[in-house]
């Protein structure tokens, strides 16, 4: 095998400082020193196959798989991962070796597997195989369950690749809409991995372990219903399994179901049918469309047709990586002290997000609700009318999202005063931010109506407490006012509040608080 090229396979571990996912790249970023992966010729394989040493990677770590080819002339290449081809841009290093790289940023379970690199040089063709797995750390994981067809049986297996081993249960419901809520009497739970009764209205599989509970719903089109409010859309990542169930009921068995993708019938082996008679002797048929590992070309409108029902469609969108789509511009709200109000974020995301609401360094649980139009919404109502900055944070395997909210509570100013030897200061947190007046109380002005304008210094907002602005006003002491009572008043559209201070007192000496509405 004299004319075989000299090949070197290396692993480069990166310092994690980037959250985007790159795929095939010719210029990996700054990193640690490369680790040699060997790349030995695989014996007894058809064609020339090199196999690199197995690569174990920590969750969220970033790596580059790199091949250095010492062969004359140009090379062309193609990466294949989970039946999807990824483009490949070889370049040449200073020693004129061909360099091909695959960058994996923030390693996740879905990015583990076999990466095949096909290289064509002027002399020969060959394949290089990398096997990438996630290092078995003590980190617990909880993965969203997915479905597989049971070999030689009309049944579905629910799988969740989680650590520790999760308890898997099917959650079944036979009525429509609201009555299929988790704790409803219409809901039946079966703690088993295999499900044979696949005719129900709503079928979900849930996996739970110490980290919580994750569920996946069997995506269903029901030809006996009018179409859903929005033409349904199902997102999947490259390599994930696709399952869509089409269900129809008719007075007798004389009808059939078919699946089409963009007007072309699905290939044999990508669907299977089941039928049963219901209690009232009507026939129920279900037809599953499935793809064990989706590629980009599985994107499109899937249409289920019947010889006795109107057809319905769903849009399946295959993405390279997960996403969270929402507007991240910050939002300011102004509410009354007893007004009911909730923050809300509307988003579209895949896979499903984990989220938190944070206020004053304290985190609150986050609930999300799916809307009819493919969006989800998370609301937070538990602000207890505390003004300040509220933060919504969401993340999934591939994306992160943060949105800031400011809550202002309309209220009359409340004044706090303090005095020192040289000045008197008043503070207020009313909203809208108050304006200030200072008045001198004297024999001439026992009602404190003589306004002080000299030596007053207002700061609109001198202190931000978790987003809450505090306004202050300071009066510098002068001989003219020493020994007198002075009154600072804060006023806004909701009222006025005052505090009276004796100016020759050595320490803070609030005297009388007036509340004038």
């Amino acid at each position: 095998n004299q004319d075989l090229p000299v090949i070197k396979c290396v692993l480069i571990n990166h310092k994690n400082n980037d959250s985007s996912v790159g795929k095939s790249s010719s210029y990996p970023m700054v990193s640690e020193s490369p680790e040699d992966l060997g790349c030995a010729l695989r014996p007894q394989s058809s064609g020339t196959v090199y196999e690199a040493a197995a690569v174990e990677v920590d969750v969220s770590a970033s790596i580059t798989l790199q091949v250095l080819v010492d062969a004359p002339g140009n090379i062309s290449c193609l990466w294949v991962f989970k039946h999807s081809s990824l483009n490949c841009q070889p370049h040449f290093d200073l020693q004129n070796r061909g360099v091909v790289s695959m960058v994996i940023l923030k390693m996740t379970e879905t990015q583990a597997g076999e990466y095949l690199l096909f290289i064509q040089s002027e002399a020969t063709n060959y394949t290089i195989l990398f096997t990438v797995s996630i290092r078995n750390t003590l980190l617990y994981t909880l993965r969203r369950p997915y479905f597989r067809k049971m070999e030689n049986q009309d049944a579905l297996v629910c799988i969740s690749e989680s650590v520790p081993e999760p308890i898997v249960e099917w959650v079944l419901c036979d009525s429509q809409g609201e009555s299929c809520k988790e704790e409803s009497p219409a809901v039946v739970k079966k703690e088993e991995k295999v499900l044979h009764e696949l005719f129900g209205t709503d079928i979900r599989c849930c996996a739970r372990n110490e980290l919580g509970r994750e569920c996946t719903r069997l995506f269903t089109i029901d030809l006996n219903q009018t179409p859903q409010t929005t033409l349904p859309q199902l997102f999947l990542k490259v390599g994930e399994p696709l399952w869509i169930r089409c269900k129809a009921v008719h007075v007798n068995h004389g009808f059939g179901l078919t699946w089409e993708l963009e007007n072309k019938a699905l290939e044999e082996g990508n669907y299977f049918e089941m039928s049963t008679y219901s209690t009232n002797r009507t026939m129920i048929r279900i037809l599953f469309a499935f793809v064990s590992s989706v590629a980009r070309n599985d994107t499109g409108y899937y249409t289920c047709s019947s010889s006795k029902h109107p057809s319905q469609s769903a849009l399946v969108t295959i993405v390279e990586k997960g996403f969270i789509n929402a507007t991240n511009s910050s939002e300011d709200y102004e509410i009354d002290q007893y007004e009911e109000f909730c923050f809300s974020v509307r988003f579209k995301a895949y896979p499903q997000i984990r989220c938190t609401w944070t206020f004053s360094r304290k985190s609150f649980p986050c609930e999300q609700k799916g809307l009819d139009n493919g969006y989800s919404i998370s609301k937070f109502c538990n602000h207890k009318h505390q003004p300040g900055e509220y933060i919504f944070h969401a993340e999934n395997d591939d994306a992160q999202f943060t949105k800031m909210f400011t809550l202002n509570i309309r209220r009359k100013p409340q004044v706090l005063a303090e005095a020192s030897a040289s000045q008197a200061s008043c503070f207020s947190d009313g909203y809208p931010l108050p304006s200030w007046t200072w008045k001198k109380c004297s024999d001439k002005s026992p009602n404190c109506t003589e306004e002080i304008t000299e030596g007053v210094w207002n700061r609109k907002a001198n202190r931000k407490v978790f987003g809450q602005w505090v306004s202050s006003s300071t009066l510098n002491m002068s001989e003219a006012i020493k020994g007198f009572l002075v009154k600072c008043c804060a006023y806004n559209s909701l009222g006025t509040s005052c505090e009276t201070i004796l100016l020759n007192s050595p320490g803070p000496f609030p005297f009388i608080q007036d509340n004038i509405s």
Epitope: N224, T226, T230, L231, S305, S307, N373
Partner: antibody, heavy 119, light 107 residues
Framework: QVQLVQSGAEVKKPGASVKVSCKAS????????MHWVRQAPGQGLEWMGI????????SYTQKLQGRVTMTRDTSTSTVYMELSSLRSEDTAVYYC????????????WGQGTLVTVSS | DIQMTQSPSSLSASVGDRVTITCRAS??????LSWYQQKPGKAPKLLIY???SLESGVPSRFSGSGSGTDFTLTISSLQPEDFATYYC?????????FGGGTKVEIK
Amino acid sequence: QVQLVQSGAEVKKPGASVKVSCKASGYTFTNYYMHWVRQAPGQGLEWMGIINPSSGSASYTQKLQGRVTMTRDTSTSTVYMELSSLRSEDTAVYYCARDRSTLVPLDYWGQGTLVTVSS
Amino acid sequence: DIQMTQSPSSLSASVGDRVTITCRASQGIRSELSWYQQKPGKAPKLLIYKASSLESGVPSRFSGSGSGTDFTLTISSLQPEDFATYYCLQHNSYPLTFGGGTKVEIK
């Protein structure tokens, strides 16, 4: 060929009800949704609702909820649209229209039925 | 509900002219949009579905484009029988909603 034939024009008093029919022929009746769309004189088109002729299930626009009912008779391949508590603003031409699929809506239309509401 | 804004509301053109009508959705509707032609006293007729697919029997001078929120109907060379009112329809979400219509008149 596909044909949707609607019932004739109607004149009704405010508060009354009207029931418009749409008879389908030239295709398998239960295989296609039927929509109802109306058009006030000189105005644009307004979607009213949809019925699944196979099961009879229907859904309506929020604006007409409680006043509109869509039904079907599979033996005669006919769909019906009944509108109650009529008002003068319900004066319009009412069309039935077939859905080829959820991706190709309203591919065949009836000729329209003029409903006039006047005291 | 999704609002469909059609423009212009009317236009005058001559036979042979290239005519463009636009439709904007208040939120993304993917490619789930159809175009209809309506002549006075007649029911609307389907021209384009799924934003750009030409209905069979419709002359090839009609074409549609766009996805998401912005859509266009183009008549490449206006014929005498094309003078009519044109409507867009979104079928992404119920209730289905039509644009306000564009009346194409003879100049």
